[in-house]
Interface confidence: medium
């Protein structure tokens, strides 16, 4: 989002021969921030603290285990995606505090706000990879015994990252800084040069590939997994169901406002009241999506506590327990406890 529109008061300069309205305060930087922006700042601050510390801890725990444990490889990659995105938060925070003024230059404008989209695509693709792994463990245990290894897992992660980078390119390319006079500031946003078709195409691709298609496939995937799990009377199936639902749902819940407002804005005229309202909510939607970057460690800890009864262990050892248990393929096609539990933890970051 963050699309430039050339008729809104926020982006008013002279495209429509605007001049300064002397009845309104000039120096908007002295005005109070809008409520959605204040909420966004609060969310950004919390996400940054929890996301950086939590994901750093997850990286630390899983990095040592990644050589021998496939689950550790999945969680390591998810944590890296989240951690990377969190690094952009201080800059985004500063920009909102300055009423969206962007003093950081064109390169930073292209890269930093694109990190959340890279995170979205990397996370959903990694989640899809993890889900495929879970699916194969349940339905193709013999194949897993023969072929499921760390090398293949790393290749799958590399493919996911590569695709995520490709899918982020449009946002990266269309992101520019633009100078404004009223009020004086430099803005960072997406500029489609009045090409509504192109803007819609990008929004639709993002909605379909980053949300609707994963929602459909993961829902089907986990429906099959859970049905098989229940039919085999696997242990802790209720808890597993709850955690899996929490895991997958968190991605879709936190990305929903961003995706909905993004697709609506691409179809609305920039001068329409609905567009102007959505524009004001833009930062809040981005910050809400950013919650994905800190939710994983929280889910891991909550899940770990659930499986341990209560928090008796240190945080690292609790996380190690949750993230690095290897799935064992048994002759019977029923899930092992470790398989169910680890899947149950968090197979997403998106």
């Amino acid at each position: 989002m963050d699309s430039f529109n050339y008729t809104t008061p926020d982006y008013g300069h002279y495209d429509d021969k605007d001049t300064l309205d002397l009845n309104t305060p000039v120096d908007k930087t002295s005005n109070t921030l809008r409520v959605p922006d204040i909420l966004a700042l609060v969310i950004f601050a919390v996400v940054f603290l929890v996301g950086v510390l939590g994901n750093a801890l997850v990286v630390w725990v899983t990095a040592f285990e990644a050589k021998r444990t496939i689950n550790a490889i999945w969680f390591l990659n998810l944590a890296v995606a989240d951690f990377l995105s969190c690094l952009a938060l201080p800059i985004l925070f500063t920009s909102i505090v300055q009423h969206h003024h962007w003093p950081f230059g064109g390169a930073a404008c292209s890269i930093l706000p694109s990190l959340i989209l890279l995170n979205m695509y990397a996370s959903i693709l990694l989640l899809a990879t993890i889900s495929a792994d879970r699916f194969l463990l349940v339905f193709k245990p013999i194949w897993c015994q023969n072929f499921r290894g760390a090398g293949l897992a790393w290749i799958a992660c590399a493919v996911a990252w590569g695709l995520a980078l490709l899918l982020t390119i449009p946002s990266f390319l269309y992101r520019v800084v633009r100078e404004e006079y009223f009020p004086p500031k430099v803005l960072c946003g997406v500029d489609y040069s009045h090409d509504k078709r192109r803007e819609r195409a990008v929004a639709i691709v993002r909605l379909v590939l980053g949300f609707l298609w994963p929602l459909l496939t993961l829902t089907i995937c986990y429906t099959f997994i859970l049905l098989r799990t229940w039919s085999r009377r696997a242990t802790r199936s209720t808890k597993t169901l709850k955690v899996v639902v929490a895991v997958v749902a968190s991605f879709f819940i936190f990305w929903l406002p961003y995706q909905v407002t993004g697709i609506m804005m691409s179809f609305l005229e920039p001068s329409s009241p609905t567009f102007l309202l959505l524009k004001k909510l833009d930062s809040l939607c981005v910050s809400f999506a950013y919650i994905n970057c800190c939710i994983n460690p929280i889910i891991y800890v909550v899940a770990g506590q659930g499986f341990q009864g209560r928090l008796r262990k240190s945080l690292p050892s609790l996380l190690r327990n949750v993230l690095t248990e290897e799935s064992v393929v048994r002759e019977s096609k029923s899930f092992t406890r470790s398989t169910v539990d680890t899947m149950a933890q968090k197979t997403q970051a998106v």
Epitope: L20, E179, D191
Partner: antibody, heavy 117, light 107 residues
């Protein structure tokens, strides 16, 4: 570093037109407004107009609007100002500037236009 | 058009002296005012924008202030390179308009 380069001088006959250039380098040309100013010998500064290269959006001083045309060539990162129907009143130094609503502004050295038969 | 009345039109001062130039706007322009310096060789430099904000490369001896419709540029301690022409410029509405200029000369 950011630079705006203007040719030193242009000599034209009355009634003719002149197209002066302002070559920008060292920054994202399409992101910043280019402003044009005029200064007649021994006199003060006068604003001619400005252009946003990312869009070609222009604003003019009504005094010169009918005779001044601001354009850009984004491929060569150059802004142009064309003045038509020149008279001796148009003999002046013309400056281009990346005004910069925040942070630094950058200025060309000016092009001296002499209108003489 | 907004008229900008700049005073004085010329000023003689000594090195190390403190000087102030003023500009009055005929209409409200809030903080949309800049101060420009033009050296004898014609080169122009913006010193102040948004009435009070100093450009990053400009020495701290320059400062801008405003009260109502009156705007001031103050040089706390004159140095030899400060002797030049100074213009105020409003950019609150079209067309942008300049003050008549102040010629600052060595006494």
């Amino acid at each position: 570093q950011v630079q705006l380069q203007q040719p030193g001088a242009e000599f034209v006959k009355p009634g003719a037109s002149v197209k002066m250039s302002c070559k920008a380098s060292g920054y994202s040309f399409t992101s910043y407004w280019i402003t044009w100013l005029k200064q007649r010998p021994g006199q003060g500064l006068e604003w001619i107009g400005d252009i946003y290269p990312g869009r070609g959006t222009t604003d003019y001083n009504e005094k010169l609007k009918s005779r001044a045309t601001l354009t850009v060539d984004t491929s060569s990162t150059t802004a142009y100002m064309q003045l038509s129907s020149l008279t001796s009143e148009d003999s002046a130094v013309y400056y281009c500037a990346r005004w910069g609503t925040t942070g630094r502004s950058y200025w060309g050295q000016g092009t001296t236009v002499t209108v003489s038969s | 058009d907004i008229q900008m009345t700049q005073s004085p039109s010329s000023l003689s001062a000594s090195l190390g002296e403190r000087v102030s130039l003023t500009c009055r706007a005929s209409q409200e322009i809030k903080t949309y005012l800049s101060w420009l310096q033009q050296k004898p060789d014609g080169t122009i430099k913006r010193l102040i924008y948004a009435a009070t904000t100093l450009e990053s490369v400009v020495p701290k001896r320059f400062s801008g202030s405003w009260s109502g419709s009156e705007y001031s540029l103050t040089i706390s301690s004159l140095e030899s390179e400060d002797f030049a022409d100074y213009y105020c410029l409003q950019y609150a509405s079209y067309p942008w308009t300049f003050g008549g200029g102040t010629k600052l000369e060595i006494k």
